[in-house]
């Protein structure tokens, strides 16, 4: 078939890095600059990504391949191949409409992306807060409150080892 | 071809004002939202602020007050009033198109002048 093919189709012949020029006889012509073919046997050449503004090349583009991009300092990749740059808030806060924010009382975010998240609730699985949380920080939970009664011991004992009621023989 | 490029930029004293434009072609420029970023020697690129293409506006906390964009659909331009200069607002100053319209989020479409010098000092 690929022999078949490339007798139809002279311009399977063509590598990557090049095109198939209808205008000069379906001659493999290299890209032009500042654009690339990445796979055999295309009709035009591809324009490079530029990385401007906000964007950093990471790569640059060949003949053969796009260019890729990060973002600079104080930014952050989102998106496949870092197709949008966010800005980075400091940890304690959320990037809003209207820029960063400090996290709302009740909300932490310890990265400098992302969104605020409530504090755990301690009491959902019958536990007491040992240390308070903060707008970088999540709650920590301890031992619920009934182990922390007067007498109760911070250690749960072992689970008897006959059933309870019956008397030992 | 899309261009943007920027003017205005310069010398001047603390407490002095300057006006940035960009003149933009090749693209709808009446229905583009604009932004305004900038980036200090040694320091984080940050945005400056922001246009709609109906005109609403947002700023930055540290220049909120100072300064002032604007658009001329009929001139294709955008513009940075900018007021009450400090020190630190010395900066490459950047216009760019603005697609995702979400603050602080440019995207691989956007496009990019290449830049004025602000620097303000006595």
């Known amino acids: 078939f690929e022999r078949t093919r490339s007798l139809q189709d002279p311009c399977s012949n063509c590598p990557a890095g090049t095109f198939c020029d209808n205008n000069r006889n379906q001659i493999c012509s290299p890209c032009p600059p500042n654009s690339f073919s990445s796979a055999g046997g295309q009709r035009t050449c591809d324009i490079c990504r530029q990385c401007k503004g906000v964007f950093r090349t990471r790569k640059e583009c060949s003949s053969t391949s796009n260019a890729e991009c990060d973002c600079t300092p104080g930014f952050h990749c989102l998106g496949a191949g870092c197709s949008m740059c966010e800005q980075d808030c400091k940890q304690g806060q959320e990037l809003t409409k209207k820029g960063c924010k400090d996290c709302c009382f009740g909300t932490f975010n310890d990265q400098k992306r992302g969104i605020c998240r409530p504090w755990t609730n301690c009491s959902l699985d019958g536990k007491s807060v040992l240390v308070n949380g903060t707008k970088e920080r999540d709650v920590v939970c301890g031992p619920s409150p009934a182990d922390l009664s007067p007498g109760a011991s911070s250690v749960t004992p072992p689970a008897p080892a006959r059933e309870p009621g019956h008397s030992p023989q | 071809q899309v261009q943007l490029v920027e003017s205005g930029g310069g010398l001047v004293q603390p407490g002095g004002s300057l006006r940035l434009s960009c003149a933009a072609s090749?693209?709808?420029?009446?229905?583009?939202?604009m932004s305004w970023a900038r980036q200090a020697p040694g320091k984080d690129f940050e945005w400056v602020s922001y246009i709609y293409s109906d005109g609403n506006t947002y700023y930055a906390d540290s220049v909120k007050g100072r300064f002032t964009i604007s658009r001329d659909n009929a001139k294709n331009t955008v513009y940075l009033q900018m007021n009450s200069l400090k020190p630190e607002d010395t900066a490459v100053y950047y216009c760019?198109?603005?697609?995702?319209?979400?603050?602080?989020?440019?995207?691989?479409?956007?496009?990019w002048g290449q830049g004025t010098q602000v620097t303000v000092s006595s």
């Open positions: 760019a198109t603005w697609h995702t319209l979400r603050v602080g989020v440019w995207d691989e479409y956007d496009y």
């Open positions: 090749g693209f709808t420029f009446s229905s583009s939202a």
